[in-house]
Amino acid sequence: MMTGTIETTGNISAEKGGSIILQCHLSSTTAQVTQVNWEQQDQLLAICNADLGWHISPSFKDRVAPGPGLGLTLQSLTVNDTGEYFCIYHTYPDGTYTGRIFLEVLESSVAEHGARFQIP
């Protein structure tokens, strides 16, 4: 029985060239987290394995930093980083939980004028 829920930062925005923290939190379950995968659409960004620690995909090594916690920090953002990000929690005995975050990367001038997503 899967009783847990994933809380995420929802829809977020950041400036081009800046950085952003992607954060998910699994609550309402006593299941053991065995691994968290971070994906952008169908591309694997990083894995945090309870046994082995962090693995960052080679193609993202320069721009992705592990943490804080089970979160992920994206650096040197470009407009192409706009899109959906998924945190996939593998747990035992519950199974797999998935959270979704939408990131919009804005040109600096746009960001300065307060165009922001509202977190629902």
């Epitope: 169908d42 694997l44 046994d51 035992y92 199974g95």
Partner: antibody
Framework: EVMMVESGGGLVKPGGSLKLSCAAS????????MSWVRQTPEKRLEWVAT????????YYPDSVKGRFTISRDNAKSTLYLQMSSLRSEDTAMYYC????????????WGQGTSVTVSS | DIQMNQSPSSLSASLGDTITITCHAS??????LSWYQQKPGNIPKLLIY???TLHTGVPSRFSGSGSGSGFTLTISSLQPEDIATYYC?????????FGGGTKLEIK
């Protein structure tokens, strides 16, 4: 080349014990979650046990919990399955399998070792 | 436990045909479904994971689709080497469970 070779199967009486081994090569064994999966004589596939890369976490279905123990020796790149209190329904071909780093599926399987539980 | 129902249990088709195998989960499994191929006298081999992602080295005539509880494996332009039994497996929740298999034969 990724290779996994199982051994230790055989004929055992109900209530008996058996220890299966799986010798792995061609990959960094300690980086991968490993499992045992069995295939019954009717060709049904059943997940039996899983162990994390460093062996810190083990997982079992209720059907074998308390009777089977999965373990690994990363220095020897070997996976084990200790089976006790064996029942006739444990009769199957036992495969060791490697999980993708992402956990999404088992990407390589060994050739299997046959276990028959019969009086 | 999540039950995985595969259909048909056996299938006969001609070379060059396009065939579809379906797998139905007893509850929502998102996209956490894999497909395996087991040729006669051989071991299971991973074809597709995450419902539609082709595993390395698998020919592009194999494709997977679906999410939630309904999934399909499609083989286009059937080849003699595709003679096998195909299994689906859910990775949504423990215990991981497999479908009963679909045995594919050539007419």
């Amino acid at each position: 080349e990724v290779m996994m070779v199982e051994s230790g199967g055989g004929l055992v009486k109900p209530g008996g014990s058996l220890k299966l081994s799986c010798a792995a090569s061609g990959f960094t064994f300690s980086s991968y979650t490993m499992s045992w999966v069995r295939q019954t004589p009717e060709k049904r596939l059943e997940w039996v046990a899983t162990i994390s890369g460093r062996g810190g976490n083990t997982y079992y279905p209720d059907s074998v919990k308390g009777r089977f123990t999965i373990s690994r020796d990363n220095a020897k790149s070997t996976l084990y399955l200790q089976m006790s209190s064996l029942r006739s329904e444990d009769t199957a071909m036992y495969y060791c399998a490697r999980w993708l780093l992402t956990y999404y599926a088992m990407d390589y399987w060994g050739q299997g070792t046959s276990v028959t539980v019969s009086s | 436990d999540i039950q995985m129902n595969q259909s048909p249990s056996s299938l006969s088709a001609s070379l060059g045909d396009t065939i579809t195998i379906t797998c139905h989960a007893s509850q929502n499994i998102n996209v956490w479904l894999s497909w395996y191929q087991q040729k006669p006298g051989n071991i299971p081999k991973l074809l597709i994971y995450k419902a539609s992602t082709l595993h390395t080295g698998v020919p592009s005539r194999f494709s997977g689709s679906g999410s939630g509880s309904g999934f399909t494996l499609t083989i286009s332009s059937l080849q003699p080497e595709d003679i096998a039994t195909y299994y689906c497996q859910q990775g949504q929740s423990y215990p991981y469970t497999f479908g009963g298999g679909t045995k594919l034969e050539i007419k």
